[in-house]
């Protein structure tokens, strides 16, 4: 004969366990129903009555089947350097991730504890490894024959254009300048081919105050010449 289906609450077999979506209540010594995600245990079970569940209040949630007396509080609102990629609902916590151009410098269980602005490689340096959600850009000096004339977190070192006749040789921070407007081979996009003022020093497009402060943060600490702005989320 098929085993009789037990309805909660029920006493488990000696040495037995409760079924899926049930828990063993130590006080009642019975297997009782868990509450579904989005709810919590309003009244715990007894020997004769099952768990009474109730919906989570606003800004609280439960993500799993549970028997918690109170729902968990959703995390605080995302800070200015973050975007909300998952809203706070009765069944899930808010998740904040770093906004475009930023990366997570210090993660927490869900989302990010500390966002920082992606490094911008200065003229003469190009991106060797692009930034990701969780890692900063890695810059490298432009090798001979290549250049970068931008301050950018995405631009790589590009080859110098090849000239019939070179007016000004290229270097790490400047493309070659040709005497004619038709180099022998197509240039890298954005490469300069018309004569222009030449500087021997890298030009910086960012303000460069004294460097010894921590990178600019969302708490409005001073911004150094290039270290990243950073922000912090509430936990």
């Amino acid at each position: 004969l098929p085993a009789q289906v037990a309805f909660t609450p029920y006493a488990p077999e000696p040495g037995g366990t409760c079924r899926l979506r049930e828990y063993y209540d130590q006080t009642a010594q019975m297997c009782c129903s868990k509450c579904p995600p989005g709810q919590h245990a309003k009244v715990f079970c007894t020997k004769t009555s099952d768990t009474v569940c109730d919906s989570c209040e606003d800004s609280t949630y439960t993500q799993l089947w549970n028997w918690v007396p109170e729902c968990l509080s959703c995390g605080s609102r995302c800070s200015s350097d973050q975007v909300e990629t998952q809203a706070c609902t009765r069944e899930q916590n808010r998740i904040c991730t770093c906004r475009p151009g930023w990366y997570c410098a210090l993660s927490k269980q869900e989302g990010c504890r500390l966002c920082a602005q992606l490094r911008k490689c200065r003229p003469g340096f190009g991106v060797a490894r692009p930034g990701t959600e969780t890692s900063d850009v890695v810059c490298k000096p432009c090798a001979p024959g290549t250049f970068s004339n931008t301050t950018s977190s995405t631009d790589i070192c590009r080859p110098h254009q090849i000239c019939h006749v070179v007016a000004i040789p290229g270097n790490a921070s400047m493309d070659a300048v040709c005497t004619s407007t038709s180099p022998t081979r197509s240039m890298a996009p954005g490469a300069v081919h018309l004569p222009q003022p030449v500087s021997t020093r890298s030009q910086h497009t960012q303000p460069t105050p004294a460097p010894s402060t921590a990178p600019g943060t969302s708490f409005l600490l001073p911004v150094g010449p290039s270290p990243p702005a950073e922000g912090s989320t509430g936990d």
């Epitope: 500390l114 920082a116 900063d136 890695v138 910086h204 010894s212 943060t217 990243p228």
Partner: antibody
């Protein structure tokens, strides 16, 4: 206030190992690149090793490559230098330094007080 | 490796003197050059970065110039607290070498 405090220096025999630590405070550790610089007694400064903020990218001077390993624990705000196969010429004060923010802000802006490593039999 | 040639290795000067220290590199380092000051028994301190920019809290009597392979640190009017050793450094390709230092002594 930015602080870098080195520890772990001492006397070690040639061929031995030592692990230096640098406890950092006063700044967002996980967003900064860090380096070790050393100075032999009465001599000039020598850059030893570098690690970027996420610990992905490391560089070493030729004199220590293959023997020293730089690492960091961003959860503990600590920088390390594991030194193996030590030689007499590794005797120096070792400084933990903040920077360079390589490719962007190229300088060492804060230095620890240094820890002395003496390699001698 | 990029060679750094710093000169002079030492100099004697008096308070109020104008002092110039030069640093020459074996190839262009595109102004990726800081200068440091070190006093006996102390850690070095950043003075200038990007060859010409003054670090926070550094007196304006310190200045830097140069580009390409030739760089200069100038102290316009030497003060008693400026007697120290000065180092240049490059941040182009690794290894990031320092100059051998210039010791500024009291005449």
């Amino acid at each position: 206030e930015v602080q870098l405090v080195e520890s772990g220096g001492g006397l070690v025999q040639p061929g031995g190992s030592l692990r230096l630590s640098c406890a950092a405070s006063g700044f967002a550790f996980s967003t900064y690149d860090l380096s070790w610089v050393r100075q032999a007694p009465g001599k000039g400064l020598e850059w030893v090793a570098y690690i970027n903020n996420g610990g992905i990218s490391t560089y070493y001077s030729d004199t220590v490559k293959g023997r020293f390993t730089i690492s960091r624990d961003n959860a503990k705000n600590t920088l390390y230098l594991q030194m193996n196969s030590l030689r007499a010429e590794d005797t120096a004060v070792y400084y933990c330094v903040r920077g360079p923010f390589y490719g962007s802000a190229n300088y060492f802006d804060y230095w620890g007080q240094g820890t002395l490593v003496t390699v001698s039999s | 490796d990029i060679q750094m040639t710093q000169s002079p290795s030492s100099l004697s000067a008096s308070v109020g003197d104008r002092v110039t220290i030069t640093c020459r590199t074996s190839e262009s380092i595109y102004s990726n050059l800081p200068w440091y000051q070190q006093k006996p028994g102390k850690a070095p301190k950043l003075l200038l970065y990007d060859a010409t920019k003054l670090a926070e809290g550094v007196p304006s009597r310190f200045s830097g110039s140069g580009s390409g392979t030739d760089y200069t640190l100038t102290i316009s009017s030497l003060q008693p607290e400026d007697f120290a050793t000065y180092y240049c450094q490059h941040f182009w390709v690794t290894p990031w070498t320092f100059g051998q230092g210039t010791k500024v002594e009291i005449k």
